[in-house]
């Protein structure tokens, strides 16, 4: 049973721990955080690039996705790979760079304020929209037609933060991803010691809002490393 606090990102203090059922990460996940590649910074130049192990796209940077480095490679070995630019082949939205989505196997541009009707062979799917509100019925459209794009509100399922309304981010919540509030000053935040170390979290908090950074709370400096409380503070 997990005694993790399921932070709603909407309160200044942590709620009492809420009981939870056990989460069982797959082998790729449980192995990944234990693997430490030498060399450090994954944002160094390509010559010094160190692959970062991952299990899911959200463990990688915003310009990356999680996949096997070799085509048809071992599914158990996945690393963060650079996102695919426009007109490149893709299998899912996260493979495409921000501002694009995967349509019929190709990364295409998405409009921030509207989304294009997504045509597949016999169905239409709306991408970038709040995915709980997808129609269950076929809606044939032309590529040039536009539909009004409603941004996801708090608690809505999302694929990436651009799916969410202003002031919200798309964060892991158990086996799904939902829109959660960006953290305000004084709210508890998660400071990852290294990129991707949140891989085993069953839920994620959003990042701190504009002008704020996630830092150790002043009165917690003396606490042990493991119990230090981080909060969003002014720069």
């Amino acid at each position: 049973t997990l005694n993790s606090v399921l932070n709603s990102n909407a309160i200044k203090n942590l709620p009492p721990p809420l009981g939870g059922a056990a989460g069982h990460p797959g082998s790729a996940v449980s192995a990944a955080p234990g693997i430490l590649y030498p060399g450090g910074n994954k944002y160094q130049t390509i010559d010094n690039y160190q692959p970062y192990p991952c299990a899911e796209d959200e463990e990688c940077g915003t310009d990356e996705y999680c996949a096997s480095p070799t085509r048809g490679g071992d599914a158990g070995v996945q690393i963060c790979l650079a996102c695919r630019k426009r007109r490149k082949r893709c299998m899912r939205h996260a493979m495409c760079c921000p501002g694009n989505y995967c349509k019929n196997g190709i990364c295409v541009s998405s409009d921030q304020n509207h989304f294009r009707g997504e045509i597949e062979e016999t169905i239409t799917e709306s991408f970038g929209n709040d995915h709980s509100t997808l129609d269950g019925y076929s809606r044939r459209t032309t590529l040039s037609s536009k539909m009004y794009h409603t941004k996801g509100q708090e608690g809505s399922v999302c694929l990436r933060s651009s799916d969410c309304a202003s002031g919200l981010c798309c964060a892991r919540h158990f086996w799904s991803k939902i829109c959660k509030p960006v953290l305000k000053e004084g709210q508890v935040c998660t400071k990852h010691r290294r990129k991707g170390s949140h891989g085993l979290e069953i839920f994620q908090r959003c990042y701190c809002g504009e002008g704020l950074s996630c830092r150790i709370q002043k009165d917690h400096h003396q606490a042990s490393n493991s119990s230090r409380l981080h909060t969003c503070q002014r720069h």
């Epitope: 939870g20 989460g23 797959g26 996260a94 158990f174 086996w175 069953i202």
Partner: antibody, heavy 115, light 108 residues
Framework: QVQLVESGGGLVQPGGSLRLSCAAS????????MTWVRQAPGKGLEWVSG????????YYADSVKGRFTISRDNSKNTLYLQMNSLRAEDTAVYYC????????WGQGTLVTVSS | DIVLTQSPATLSLSPGERATLSCRAS???????LAWYQQKPGQAPRLLIY???NRATGVPARFSGSGSGTDFTLTISSLEPEDFAVYYC?????????FGQGTKVEIK
């Protein structure tokens, strides 16, 4: 349109096993977490298990932990629930559904555990 | 576990009347991580509301959700014949995600 079709239900003796399948279509399967929910005859809804889009993260209700295994094959757009050591209290209609709040549901498949 | 208690257990109303269904959580949800479903006999449930107040696609405007903290409400402004069914609430803040026991809306 989005469609979820369960199969694999049936009559099984206590202690027996069954594997349920849920064939998904009409959406990009690997973008979504999937959920199994069950409903005993004349009763309410009970969450059973959930799995993330890539299959890396799985979650179980205490009542089925250690007996049931959720999995998915994204290349086949199919969700599975392997049920072992079945008990009479596992008798229910099993539904597969999309995401943590269930925006689309299958029609359900009946699992009866009885001797 | 978070327990959701729905009331009343049964609501007897006539078409055209307003229905107010309550869902109370045993702990403060802090966030609007609550959904409502409708289920008719022999059918799978259908999502009506998510995020406490967002209507799912295809759900008529007569259905609305509200509330926060521990108290949530589903309102059907004017009952249509097809609205007579069982309604469930679900919280997805913490695991296990739990459902209320249901409220049956029946024809008076």
């Amino acid at each position: 349109q989005v469609q979820l079709v369960e199969s694999g239900g049936g009559l099984v003796q206590p202690g027996g096993s069954l594997r349920l399948s849920c064939a998904a279509s009409g959406f990009t399967f690997n973008n979504y977490g999937m959920t199994w929910v069950r409903q005993a005859p004349g009763k309410g809804l009970e969450w059973v298990s959930g799995i993330s889009g890539s299959g890396s993260y799985t979650y179980y209700a205490d009542s089925v932990k250690g007996r049931f295994t959720i999995s998915r094959d994204n290349s086949k757009n199919t969700l599975y629930l392997q049920m072992n050591s079945l008990r009479a209290e596992d008798t229910a209609v099993y539904y597969c559904a999309r995401t943590i709040y269930m925006d689309y549901w299958g029609q359900g498949t009946l699992v009866t555990v009885s001797s | 576990d978070i327990v959701l208690t729905q009331s009343p257990a049964t609501l007897s109303l006539s078409p055209g009347e307003r229905a107010t269904l309550s869902c109370r959580a045993s702990q403060n949800l802090f966030s609007p991580y609550l959904a409502w479903y409708q289920q008719k006999p022999g059918q799978a449930p259908r999502l009506l509301i998510y995020g406490a107040s967002n209507r799912a696609t295809g759900v008529p405007a007569r259905f609305s959700g509200s509330g926060s903290g521990t108290d949530f409400t589903l309102t059907i402004s004017s009952l249509e014949p097809e609205d007579f069914a069982v309604y469930y609430c679900q919280q997805y803040l913490s695991l296990p995600t739990t459902f209320g026991q249901g409220t049956k809306v029946e024809i008076k």
